[in-house]
């Protein structure tokens, strides 16, 4: 056959769906690869063709759209499973073509099993709630387009394995779950089960997400440098190792880039002809506040190095701070017999 623009296997969209549930999968061509939508393509006389490769097979085969109860169907640019089966797992390809044009992309679809407590290998989206911040909501995700607005589904919410009813500060409100005042104890996996009728059958959609309670912007402060500080003096003799930790606390801030860096005499350490290494470690609190430590180390410090200015800098969306380390050359202790004795007139 003639050449086709092949976008390859789009592993960025690793689609996971639960077994025995409906799934609607849009052809990624129109969302991520082509500059026009399905209706434009359709009205220009292009046809959308679907096929697939089963898991652990190399053979591409057409999708069987003649299964009982139209289990698999296509509607515009959407491939429908009503419902999925475990052996639907594989790589699916959608191809847009006519006699002069062809473009295609493949994507992996994994049908996943869940247990009675909704545990599964499914990768879960994370929703962050601010601690003690007032009412916040999460919404049952990815249920649009499964049923018309005239259909009123029933929605049941679970935390872990437990149905949410009469919880202190968590209230189910249809597609939304409201947290009156989020606390660390609200961390966990939350599942909504959406049940709706279609053509005399009942379908369930299960959606699980992880709630993580994080520091509130109300409590956020600029970075705090705990070390270096005014109480510690790094007193070294030439030839010794100089180790200066820079320890910085960052409040949790959504989408903030936290950075820590050292300057030596106002310059980037790399820019200076000095054998310096910097090692970084990062730890997080339960509310995702961050502590970064960068240890500056000079294996064999020279007297010249001990005169330099060592400054730790830190920056977040809340501001930039800097602190200089107090570095000095150790004065050698006098040798009593020679120096002090001479002072007392000894000969």
């Amino acid at each position: 056959s003639e050449r086709c623009d092949d976008w390859g296997l789009d592993t960025m969209r690793q689609i996971q769906v639960f077994e025995d549930e409906p799934a609607r999968i849009k052809c990624p061509l129109f969302e991520h690869f082509l500059k026009f939508n399905y209706s434009t393509a359709h009205s220009a006389g292009l046809t959308l063709i679907w096929y697939w490769t089963r898991q652990d097979r190399d053979l591409e085969e057409p999708i069987n759209f003649r299964l009982p109860e139209n289990r698999i169907s296509k509607e515009k640019d959407v491939l429908w499973f009503r419902p999925t089966l475990l052996n639907d797992t594989g790589n699916y390809t959608c191809m847009l073509r006519n006699t002069t044009y062809c473009s295609k992309v493949a994507f992996p679809l994994e049908v996943v099993q869940k247990d009675s407590c909704f545990n599964s290998p499914m990768k879960l989206p994370v929703h962050k709630l601010y601690i003690e911040y007032g009412i916040q909501r999460i919404t049952c995700p990815n249920v649009d387009g499964y049923f018309p607005s005239s259909v009123k589904p029933t929605i049941t919410w679970y935390m872990g394995c437990y149905k949410i009813q009469n919880f202190n500060n968590v209230i189910p409100e249809g597609m939304n779950l409201s947290f009156l005042i989020a606390l660390i104890s609200n961390n966990g996996n939350y599942t909504c089960v959406v049940t709706y009728p279609e053509n005399g059958r009942t379908f369930h959609l299960t959606r699980t997400l992880t709630v993580k309670v994080v520091g509130s912007p109300k409590n956020a402060v600029p970075p705090v440098i705990h070390s270096p500080n005014d109480h510690v003096v790094y007193e070294k003799e030439p030839g010794e190792e100089l180790l200066i930790p820079c320890t910085v606390y960052f409040s949790f801030l959504m989408d903030s880039r936290n950075e820590v860096w050292w300057t030596i005499d106002g310059k980037k350490p790399d820019d200076i002809t000095i054998d310096v290494t910097i090692n970084e470690s990062i730890s997080h609190s339960r509310t995702e506040d961050e502590t970064r430590t960068q240890i500056l180390s000079i294996k064999k410090v020279t007297s010249e190095d001990l005169k330099r200015s060592y400054v730790c800098h830190a920056r977040s969306a809340k501001g930039e701070v800097a602190k200089a380390a107090k570095v000095k050359q150790k004065v050698p202790a006098p040798r009593y017999t020679v120096e002090l004795a001479c002072g007392f007139g000894a000969t």
């Epitope: 300057t263 005499d265 106002g266 310059k267 820019d271 005169k307 200015s309 930039e320």
Partner: antibody, heavy 124, light 107 residues
Framework: QVHLQQSGPELVRPGTSVKISCEAS????????INWVKQRPGQGLEWIGQ????????YYNEMFKDKARFTVDKSSSTAYMQFSSLTSEDTAVYFC?????????????????WGQGTSVTVSS | DIQMTQSPASLSASVGETVTITCRTS??????LAWYQQKQGKSPQLLVH???TLAEGVPSRFSGSGSGTQFSLKINSLKPEDFGSYYC?????????FGAGTKLELK
């Protein structure tokens, strides 16, 4: 606001030396480099070198390392450049300019504030 | 030392025109390049640092671009106060070098 005030014009004899001052105000003097830049009449800019007041660290352009010497007086937030063995080639306007410190976000050491320049004329 | 090649050496343009000055470096300097403007008898003024970051108070008709070894300064719709000399400078490491300059004159 940041201000760099340079000393006045100098008329000097060949073979002698000259010391130009640059008084800084409006920022923390110790934490920024003071750079020195030469501009001969009708010519471009030449970087002479820099000094870091907090530690007296210096870097010199190879072409000037035997000619220029930088010092600072921390108490008065003033930087000095001494130019020695003067010849007619040293007739120029000399600028001091502030740079750095390095920032993860703003990169390296652009010269963000400049003094008004000191004119040095070497003539017998 | 890093060599800076700035072009053109001089340039004539009219008010309202758009001009571009380029600067090439002898080795990769990432984005550590600054542009300065200098008017006759005055001190230079920082326009752009880190290749594309406008300095405080610089009008948005100025823009810097490039990285590695190729850089440019673009001035959109020239104003009378834009005429003068322009210099590039790498601000990297422990030795800073200026380009030879571009004199922008009124046509």
């Amino acid at each position: 606001q940041v201000h760099l005030q340079q000393s006045g014009p100098e008329l000097v004899r060949p073979g002698t030396s000259v010391k130009i001052s640059c008084e800084a105000s409006g920022y923390i003097f110790l934490t920024y480099w003071i750079n020195w830049v030469k501009q001969r009449p009708g010519q471009g800019l030449e970087w002479i070198g820099q000094i870091f007041p907090a530690s007296d660290s210096t870097y010199y352009n190879e072409m000037f390392k035997d000619k220029a010497r930088f010092t600072v007086d921390k108490s008065s937030s003033t930087a000095y450049m001494q130019f020695s063995s003067l010849t007619s080639e040293d007739t120029a306007v000399y600028f001091c300019a502030r740079s750095g410190p390095y920032s993860y976000y703003a990169g390296g050491y652009a010269l963000d504030y400049w003094g008004q320049g000191t004119s040095v004329t070497v003539s017998s | 030392d890093i060599q800076m090649t700035q072009s053109p050496a001089s340039l004539s343009a009219s008010v309202g025109e758009t001009v571009t000055i380029t600067c090439r470096t002898s080795e990769n300097i990432n984005s550590y390049l600054a542009w300065y403007q200098q008017k006759q008898g005055k001190s230079p003024q920082l326009l752009v640092h880190y290749a594309k970051t406008l300095a405080e108070g610089v009008p948005s008709r100025f823009s810097g671009s490039g990285s590695g070894t190729q850089f440019s300064l673009k001035i959109n719709s020239l104003k009378p106060e834009d005429f003068g000399s322009y210099y590039c400078q790498h601000h990297y490491g422990t030795s800073l070098t200026f380009g030879a300059g571009t004199k922008l004159e009124l046509k």
